[in-house]
Interface confidence: medium
């Protein structure tokens, strides 16, 4: 999960750019991402008790179907086949009223924040936070970006406590600590 | 059990090379970026390099740049510090860092004496 | 660059007693768009290597006992030690990682135990 060059002092960051329809901007990496994707458990630190919860889904594991699934019966396959399209469909089209309705809410609100320290126009966002922004909408300023941190599939080695994270339904597991992505 | 453990050090002449290392291991290595920290005898702490996880980042401070290398074998969960024409001023302690969010973890140090 | 000041360079305090180390940055840390401070606090005892001991200026590390306290915002900051123990014997140093490269720290203050 790779995202562009960006100067590394943080500064002239472009503003988020839009995202495709299966993927949701998230303030926290800055970055698009698969609406479903989760980050990695944090190792525990020495002396730490029972390793961090996991969720159902990690990021190096296959999202489509598994070995057990591959040999579905030809009425599975013509049946199933359309289902998922039509899913997919639906969730693009929700995904599309998402991403609209937000826009109209920030230009409601007249999003943009004007202060600015020594920074990028990227900001990290609190660790709840993995939203869906329109594109063109920038922070005036921020820390360096990324805050310090690693790959969005990654929290850092200790304690991992998952919460919903997402205002599309999937859960990520987070930390206390996380402050966000890789520098890039 | 998070670890970091650094060797290397030792004593080299000025202008000498030295490669130090920190092998990883309790912790995804290959998820995560590094920074190796120095200790000059009776001084403070001095951030010396950067390497993001997958090495496509790197940087240096402006006292070693040109001279230190930072690099990783992520398969290998090893961290290196390639130091070439040491300086006295490079004599220190070097520290290698789990990079999250600040230095999370640090490990127990080499020890490099640059002198003739 | 940032450049990160701590005062006093060393102090000396009896077991039991309240101590309070300042550190304070070249511009600020403080980040409006998510009100956190970008300062680390770290403390490193002698012949050992650095320990993190808050984060986000005031959140303590698992593990760090409740003596410790961060707080400040913006450019001043300040380490509070409730109530010394001998094994608080140490140096400690802060750090900011508001823009970077270079993670800078402080110079760091002693704490002596009388």
């Known amino acids: 999960m790779r995202r562009g060059p960006r100067s590394l002092r943080g500064r002239d960051a472009p503003a988020p750019t839009p995202c495709v329809p299966a993927e949701c901007f998230d303030l926290l990496v800055r970055h698009c991402v698969a609406c479903g994707l989760l980050r990695t458990p944090r190792p525990k630190p020495a002396g730490a008790s029972s390793p961090a919860p996991r969720t159902a889904l990690q990021p190096q594991e296959s999202v489509g179907a598994g070995a057990g699934e591959a040999a579905l019966p030809l009425p599975g396959l013509l049946f199933g086949a359309p289902a998922l399209l039509g899913l997919a469909l639906v969730l693009a089209l929700v995904l599309v009223g998402l991403v609209s309705w937000r826009r109209r809410q920030r230009r409601l609100r007249g999003a943009s924040s004007a202060e600015a320290p020594d920074g990028d126009k990227d900001a990290p966002e609190p660790l709840d936070k993995v939203i869906i922004l329109s594109p063109g909408i920038s922070d005036a300023t921020a820390p360096a970006w990324p805050p310090p941190g690693e790959d969005p599939g990654t929290t850092p080695p200790g304690h991992s406590v998952p919460v919903p994270a997402t205002e599309l339904g999937s859960t990520e597991l987070v930390t206390t600590k996380t402050a966000g992505p890789e520098q890039q | 059990d998070v670890q970091l453990v650094e060797s290397g050090g030792g004593l080299v002449q000025p202008g000498g090379s030295r490669k130090l290392s920190c092998a990883a291991s309790g912790f995804t290595f290959s998820s995560f970026g590094m920074h190796w920290v120095r200790q000059a005898p009776e001084k403070g702490l001095e951030w010396v390099a950067y390497i993001n996880s997958g090495s496509s980042t790197i940087n240096y401070a402006d006292t070693v740049k040109g001279r230190f290398t930072i690099s990783r074998d992520n398969p290998k969960n090893t961290l290196f510090l390639q130091m070439t024409s040491l300086r006295s001023e490079d004599t220190a302690m070097y520290y290698c860092t789990i990079y999250y969010y600040a230095m999370d973890y640090w490990g127990q140090g080499t020890s490099v004496t640059v002198s003739s | 660059d940032i450049v990160m000041s701590q005062s006093p360079s060393s102090l000396t305090v009896s077991v039991g007693e309240k101590v309070s180390m300042s550190c304070k940055s070249s511009?600020?840390?403080?980040?409006?768009?998510?009100?956190?401070?970008?300062l680390a606090w770290y403390q490193q005892k002698p012949g050992q290597s650095p320990k993190l001991l808050i984060y986000w200026a005031s959140t303590r590390e698992s593990g760090v006992p409740d003596r410790f306290a961060g707080s400040g915002s913006g450019t001043d900051f300040t380490l509070t030690i409730s109530s010394v123990k001998a094994e608080d014997l140490a140096v400690y140093y802060c750090?900011?990682?508001?823009?970077?490269?270079?993670?800078?720290f402080g110079g760091g203050t002693k704490l002596e135990i009388k």
């Open positions: 750090q900011q990682y508001y823009i970077y490269p270079p993670w800078t």
């Open positions: 511009q600020t840390l403080l980040y409006s768009g998510n009100q956190k401070n970008y």
